[in-house]
Amino acid sequence: MSNSVPLLCFWSLCYCFAAGSPVPFGPEGRLEDKLHKPKATQTEVKPSVRFNLRTSKDPEHEGCYLSVGHSQPLEDCSFNMTAKTFFIIHGWTMSGIFENWLHKLVSALHTREKDANVVVVDWLPLAHQLYTDAVNNTRVVGHSIARMLDWLQEKDDFSLGNVHLIGYSLGAHVAGYAGNFVKGTVGRITGLDPAGPMFEGADIHKRLSPDDADFVDVLHTYTRSFGLSIGIQMPVGHIDIYPNGGDFQPGCGLNDVLGSIAYGTITEVVKCEHERAVHLFVDSLVNQDKPSFAFQCTDSNRFKKGICLSCRKNRCNSIGYNAKKMRNKRNSKMYLKTRAGMPFRVYHYQMKIHVFSYKNMGEIEPTFYVTLYGTNADSQTLPLEIVERIEQNATNTFLVYTEEDLGDLLKIQLTWEGASQSWYNLWKEFRSYLSQPRNPGRELNIRRIRVKSGETQRKLTFCTEDPENTSISPGRELWFRKCRDGWRMKNETSPTVELP
C-alpha cells in the first residue's frame, strides 16, 4: 500500500504520521482512545473474518456462518447454488458493532432478489483498528473472500458470474482484492464510496480497479479536492458515478444533520456524505420504479453547466443496482443530481438560453430563476447556476432539476432577481452605478429557450409569449411558451434501462 499520506483526517479525526507530531486529537477526544485495539484481539480471535449467510430478512435470525471445507452450513441455510450471491463488505469502523446501513442493505437485497444468497463479510476485528492498520488488513480479508469463492466454485452449479461483491469505503478495496485473488472473474463489484486515504493514486493492484470483476461500478459521494478526501476521487471502475459532483450531498449540511441536536459534530456530516453511497444503492433496490440516471461528463463543472445530458452512445446509465453493464468503458465519469432523501431521483433539464443583446451589465452577474410549468405539476422556483459568466450573442447553457415529474413542459417563467442578496453585490452594484451614471438600465434580450429533458431525452423550444417583448431587466420576468414547431424530438436513446 502507498503510505505517502502525511495527514489522515478521517471522519474529522486528525492523525499525523509525521515524525514528532503532537498527540492526535479529534472533536471527541484522543484518536487512540477512539481507535484502541481491543485487548487480546489478535491472539485469541479465530477466524478474524466471518461469513454470515443471512437467510432471512429478520435481523433476529442468526443466519449461518460459512467456513471453507464445511458444507453443512450451506445445507442448513439452504444456500442456492444457482441464484445470485451477494457479499456485503463493511469498511473501517470506530465501533465494535455493525453500522446501521448494513441491515438496510441486507433487507433491500432480500426484498429485491428473493432467492438470492446474501452473505455479510464480518471483518470487524480487523477493521476496528487504527485506520492504517485496517488498510493493511484489507489484503488479508480479500484473500479470505477469494478462498471462500474458490471453495464455492468447487460445488456443482455455482457460478462466479452470479457473484456480486458490494463493498463500502475500505470494504470496496477489500472487494477489489477479492476479485483480484479469486480463480476466475466475479460477475460484478459495486464500490460504495471507496476509501480515499492510502488508495488515492495507488497502483491498480493495490486498490479497486476495473480488472477486479467483469463489471465494476462505483458511487463516489464524499470526495474533496481540498483537505483530505474520505472517499477516493479518482475513477476506479468501468463506470464511476459522482452524485451531486461527488462531494456535498443534499441533506448532509451542518444545518440539515445537526438540526436541533445539541452535541453534534462535523463527524455526522462526514458520515452522512460518505454513507450516502450506500443509501443511493439501497434506493436503487427498493425504488426500482424511480430509477436515478447519471450522465457521462468530463468534469463536474461541465455537468453543472448542463452540457452533459446525452444518452447517445451509452452516455447515460441507471445508478446503483440497476446500472447497465458497460464493459467497453473504463473510468467513465458520470454525474447526476439527487434529492436529500429516498427516493433520490430528480428530473434533469438542460436549458439553452441565447442572449442576443446585453445592456449595461456592470460587474456583477445577474441572478436568474426559472419556474417550469408542466402537464403533471409545476416546479418550484429554480435558480439558474451561472458557472462562469453570461455571454452575450451566445448560447448560455444551464442545468436545472426538479424533484417532481412535471410531465410535458408547457411554459417557462424566467425571473431576473432584483434586489441584491449580499453587501458585496450591493457594493458592486453601487460601483457599477457610479461608473455608468448615464446608463442605469440593465437589460438583456432573449427570444427563446431550448430545453432538453435528461430523463426522456426530449427536446423542446420555448418562445417568448409576446414576440415583440424579448427584454428582461432586474426585478422583471419573461414568459415563454412552447414554440409552434413545438416538439423536436431527436433520435436519441432514452435512458430506459432493462432492470437486471
Partner: antibody
Amino acid sequence: EVQLQQSGPELLKPGASVKISCKASGYTFTDYTMHWVKQSHGKSLEWIGGINPYYGGTTYNEKFKDKATLTVDKSSSTAYMELRSLTSEDSAVYYCAKGDYYGGSYNYWGQGTTLTVSS
Amino acid sequence: DIVLTQSLATLSVTPGDSVSLSCRASQDISNSLHWYQQKSHESPRLLIKYASQSISGIPSRFSGSGSGTDFTLSINSVETEDFGMYFCQQSNSWPYTFGGGTKLEIK
C-alpha cells in the same frame, strides 16, 4: 430459550466502583452484541453502550465513556459492566439487552440490577 | 444526538378502544425505530422492530408504521394487559436513543 440473568442489587457509597454481570444462555453468545441500558427512577431509558463478544470491540455513548467499561468472558458467556466513581446520579436500574444480528433492536432483556449510591 | 419525542406523556383509554402512539425523530432515521412496552417493575419488552416488523409472541393487535421522522405504534382494541409505559428507540446512529415514553392508562 434465551435468558439473560443479571447480578443482584447493590448498595454502595459515593466514589466506589461496581461490576454488574449478565450471564447469557440459550443462544451462541459470540454471535450477538450485548448492550447496557440505564433507567433512573421514574425516567426514560438511556443507552450506555454495546460490546461485540466475538472479539471485545465496544461502542459507548459519549455521556458514559468515562463512567462505564464493558467487557465479556466468552468462556462463561457473561457480559460485565463496571461503573466507577459512583455518585447519587448513578442510582438507577441497569439492564443488559441482547442485540439482534445488527445490534439495533433488543428482543431479550435481563431482569435489571438496582444500584443505589448513598452515603 | 438524535432526539426522539413522544409528545403524549399520558394517554387515557378505555379497554376495547383503538389507540395510536406517536414518536418523532429530530432527523431522518429511515426505518430504524423500535417500540418497547414496559410494565411497572418489569424489564422492557420488544413489540415492533424496524418501524413495522412484528415480533413473534407479540399479539397481532400491535402494529407499527412510519419512516423518516414520524412513527406510530397502533394498538387495535386495547386490552387491560396493555396498560403501561411505551418507549420508542432509534438505532440509526450512535448513540442509540430512547423517547421519553408514553404512559397508557385506564380511563
